[in-house]
């Protein structure tokens, strides 16, 4: 693994993709989504220590300033670098519709 | 302002653009950047309460699951939605070069 992918805090502690099993009720979708009934939600969770999966120059700056002024500047944060697509069947006034979402499930993660 | 831009925590507490004055030393750039000597670093700082500047459907899901499982799922986090370009004059082996960076200064912010 590249240096930027090795977590100095221990395995699984740094920014990475997690899967959370959720029902429509959990997601607050029960009143407008019919299908799927349950979703394996992939999201980005974990710490962003120095040089770990830095997305860009801005993330490097943010980390440097965070070390200098931790009360003012937060550490970079773990967010999706890209997404996986997903289809929902939704309730409409006239029946049902098929909707595609390209920004719903995280595919991979980085620190910004 | 749209509902998603009104901070329920009070003015200035939610995710927004901040400017942090930094020297090359602060940024860790003193050994490879000649100019500018100082940078007005714009970055995204602040809380992401429910429905505030949600970047996409993923952010909505994350907030709903955070409320349900706060120990497992963190709240959405304040990150750049876009960037402003910046030019640096850098030291090189042969002298100096002008480099434009498109991912250095945050332009506006949202919650992901």
């Amino acid at each position: 693994a590249r240096n930027g992918d090795r977590c100095p805090l221990g395995p699984g502690r740094c920014c990475r993709l997690h899967t959370v099993h959720a029902s429509l009720e959990d997601l607050g979708w029960a009143d407008w989504v019919l299908s799927p009934r349950e979703v394996q939600v992939t999201m980005c969770i974990g710490a962003c220590p120095s040089q770990f999966r830095e997305a860009n120059m801005h993330a490097q700056i943010k980390m440097n300033l965070h070390r200098l002024k931790p009360d003012t500047v937060p550490a970079p944060c773990c967010v999706p670098a890209s997404y996986n697509p997903m289809v929902l069947i939704q309730k409409t006034d006239t029946g049902v519709s098929l909707q595609t979402y390209d920004d719903l499930l995280a595919k991979d993660c980085h620190c910004v | 302002a749209r509902n998603g831009d009104r901070c329920p925590l009070g003015p200035g507490r939610c995710c927004r653009l901040h400017t942090v004055h930094a020297s090359l030393e602060d940024l860790g750039w003193a050994d490879w950047v000649l100019s500018p000597r100082e940078v007005q670093v714009t970055m995204c700082i602040g809380a992401c309460p429910s429905q505030f500047r949600e970047a996409n459907m993923h952010a909505q899901i994350k907030m709903n699951l955070h409320r349900l499982k706060p120990d497992t799922v963190p709240a959405p986090c304040c990150v750049p939605a876009s960037y402003n370009p910046m030019v640096l004059i850098q030291k090189t082996d042969t002298g100096v070069s002008l480099q434009t960076y498109d991912d250095l200064l945050a332009k506006d912010c949202h919650c992901v």
């Epitope: 019919l34 299908s35 799927p36 009934r37 349950e38 996986n84 697509p85 997903m86 289809v87 929902l88 069947i89 029946g95 049902v96 519709s97 098929l98 595609t100 390209d102 | -």
Partner: antibody
């Protein structure tokens, strides 16, 4: 494991109707959607429609509106497709397919062969 | 309706060959394309979802790529059990549509 057991082959006369069944087992019936797909001999696949087992909401391919009626019986974990005013063009293999994600078809029945002939 | 065109209609290959099957959509469908295998007198079987995502239980020699209008199913070393029909299906909009299929046969 998830299984979809379809009814046996049918030989019916032109103009008649027929009701095909698809019995689900190995999962909670209302957890997955049911789709129906037509395949004529040596040809491709055609999506007929989708049904939501929890309350019977359905959506049809416009081409099959009036030709097919989709229903479910949650008490017996069975989905049905009735085909009306049959012609030789309706002779085909009909598959039911269960979907955990509404985008694709992950579980298929074995198919029911329908022959329309006088 | 979205039309999916598969090519070639028939592909004759030798076990061990690497093959690529094409599926072209009449308009952009992002990543909303799925691949199935169907052997003679059997039901279709899902191989790849959302253009490139693998399916549990499907051999790793099957892979998918593409987005927008052009998609490819690759089999990196064909085995005898892989011969049959291959169909693509789109879920970008209703009605769902399938390609006409590619027949993979032994040379």
């Amino acid at each position: 494991q998830v299984q979809l057991q379809q009814s046996g082959p049918e030989l019916v006369k032109p103009g008649a109707s027929v009701k095909l069944s698809c019995k689900a087992s190995g999962y909670t019936f209302t957890s997955y959607d049911i789709n129906w797909v037509k395949q004529r001999p040596g040809q491709g696949l055609e999506w007929i429609g989708w049904i939501y087992p929890r309350d019977g909401i359905s959506k049809y391919n416009e081409k099959f509106e009036g030709k097919a009626t989709l229903t479910v019986d949650t008490s017996s974990s069975t989905a049905y497709m009735e085909l009306h005013s049959l012609t030789s063009e309706d002779s085909a293999v009909y598959f039911c397919a269960g979907t955990s994600d509404p985008a694709y078809f992950d579980y298929w029945g074995q198919g029911t062969t329908l022959t329309v002939s006088s | 309706d979205i039309v999916l065109t598969q090519s070639p209609a028939t592909l004759s290959v030798t076990p061990g060959d690497r093959v690529s099957l094409s599926c072209r959509a009449s308009q952009s469908i992002s990543y909303y394309l799925h691949w199935y295998q169907q052997k003679s007198h059997e039901s279709p079987r899902l191989l790849i979802k959302y253009a490139s995502q693998s399916i549990s239980g499907i051999p790793s020699r099957f892979s998918g790529s593409g987005s927008g209008t052009d998609f490819t199913l690759s089999i990196n070393s064909v085995e005898t059990e892989d011969f049959g029909m291959y169909f693509c299906q789109q879920s970008n909009s209703w009605p769902y549509t399938f390609g006409g299929g590619t027949k993979l046969e032994i040379k």
